[in-house]
Interface confidence: medium
């Protein structure tokens, strides 16, 4: 028979044959052959693999570094990574929660929708058209672009979500 060019779900193609992938929580030891099944081994104590895979090494569980204000929210298993969270009163800087801040700043291009309180973190929002923020701030809202017209000037450079418009003098040479 013709060697396969594609395999079923949870299989992979190697040496012109389809081998079973290792299940989550296990790593690949050896590929299948004509006569043997794929050989897999469970991940070690502080390791995991969260997909059907052909990885030869498991991933290390995330370390929740107390020096960064982190603690374990959910202990990892052979199939899942450890989930970190911040100490009481602190907030994660990102969804991955790799470090903690007392309250988060909104990056340039974003403004503060709601200032942090003792229990909730800063809420940021993207600056809409007509507004900008050029600073990283835990307090500042998006500012409206300068209105050149009210100063009897014209827009020389358009504004963005991170920059104000640049105004300049009217062109006096118009007929």
């Amino acid at each position: 028979p013709e060697p396969p060019t594609a395999c079923r779900e949870k299989q992979y193609l190697i040496n012109s044959q389809c081998c079973s992938l290792c299940q989550p929580g296990q790593k690949l030891v050896s590929d299948c052959t004509e006569f043997t099944e794929t050989e897999c081994l469970p991940c070690g104590e502080s390791e995991f693999l969260d997909t059907w895979n052909r990885e030869t090494h498991c991933h290390q569980h995330k370390y929740c570094d107390p020096n960064l204000g982190l603690r374990v929210q959910q202990k990892g298993t052979s199939e899942t990574d450890t989930i970190c969270t911040c100490e009481e009163g602190w907030h994660c800087t990102s969804e991955a929660c790799e470090s903690c801040v007392l309250h988060r700043s909104c990056s340039p291009g974003f403004g503060v929708k709601q200032i942090a309180t003792g229990v909730s973190d800063t809420i940021c929002e993207p600056c809409p058209v007509g507004f900008f923020s050029n600073v990283s701030s835990a307090f500042e809202k998006c500012h409206p672009w300068t209105s050149c017209e009210t100063k009897d000037l014209v827009v020389q450079q358009a504004g963005t979500n991170k920059t104000d418009v640049v105004c300049g003098p009217q062109d006096r040479l118009r007929a």
């Epitope: 470090s99 903690c100 801040v101 309250h103 600073v135 701030s137 835990a138 500042e140």
Partner: nanobody, 116 residues
Framework: EVQLLESGGGLVQPGGSLRLSCAAS????????MQWVRQAPGKGLEWVSA????????YYADSVKGRFTISRDNSKNTLYLQMNSLRAEDTAVYYC?????????WGQGTLVTVSS
């Protein structure tokens, strides 16, 4: 290397005043929003006040609004906190901070004790 050095703490009677200073070095001071944060004995950190890089915008926790005033002198790379009408519950170590990350650019703090 970023350095923040707080001073001006001490023992004061309820109703009294103190002015804290924070001398900053190792970064372009006027580019950064600066903050005061405090930690009362046995309690967690509490944000107190912040000021924009240009000094025009100030922000306060409800617990200190109307009593404390934050200011800065960018020519001297110094942040200030004027504390009036002090209360026993203002007793804490006061830190100035450039960022509010855990162990991020904190000074060593200055102790303010309000007691009769």
């Amino acid at each position: 290397e970023v350095q923040l050095l707080e001073s001006g703490g001490g023992l004061v009677q309820p109703g009294g005043s103190l002015r804290l200073s924070c001398a900053a070095s190792g970064f372009t001071f006027e580019w950064y929003e600066m903050q005061w944060v405090r930690q009362a004995p046995g309690k967690g950190l509490e944000w107190v006040s912040a000021i924009s890089g240009d000094g025009y915008r100030t922000y306060y926790a409800d617990s200190v609004k109307g009593r404390f005033t934050i200011s800065r002198d960018n020519s001297k790379n110094t942040l200030y906190l004027q504390m009036n009408s002090l209360r026993a519950e203002d007793t804490a170590v006061y830190y100035c901070a450039k960022e509010l990350g855990y162990f991020d650019y904190w000074g060593q703090g200055t102790l303010v004790t309000v007691s009769s």
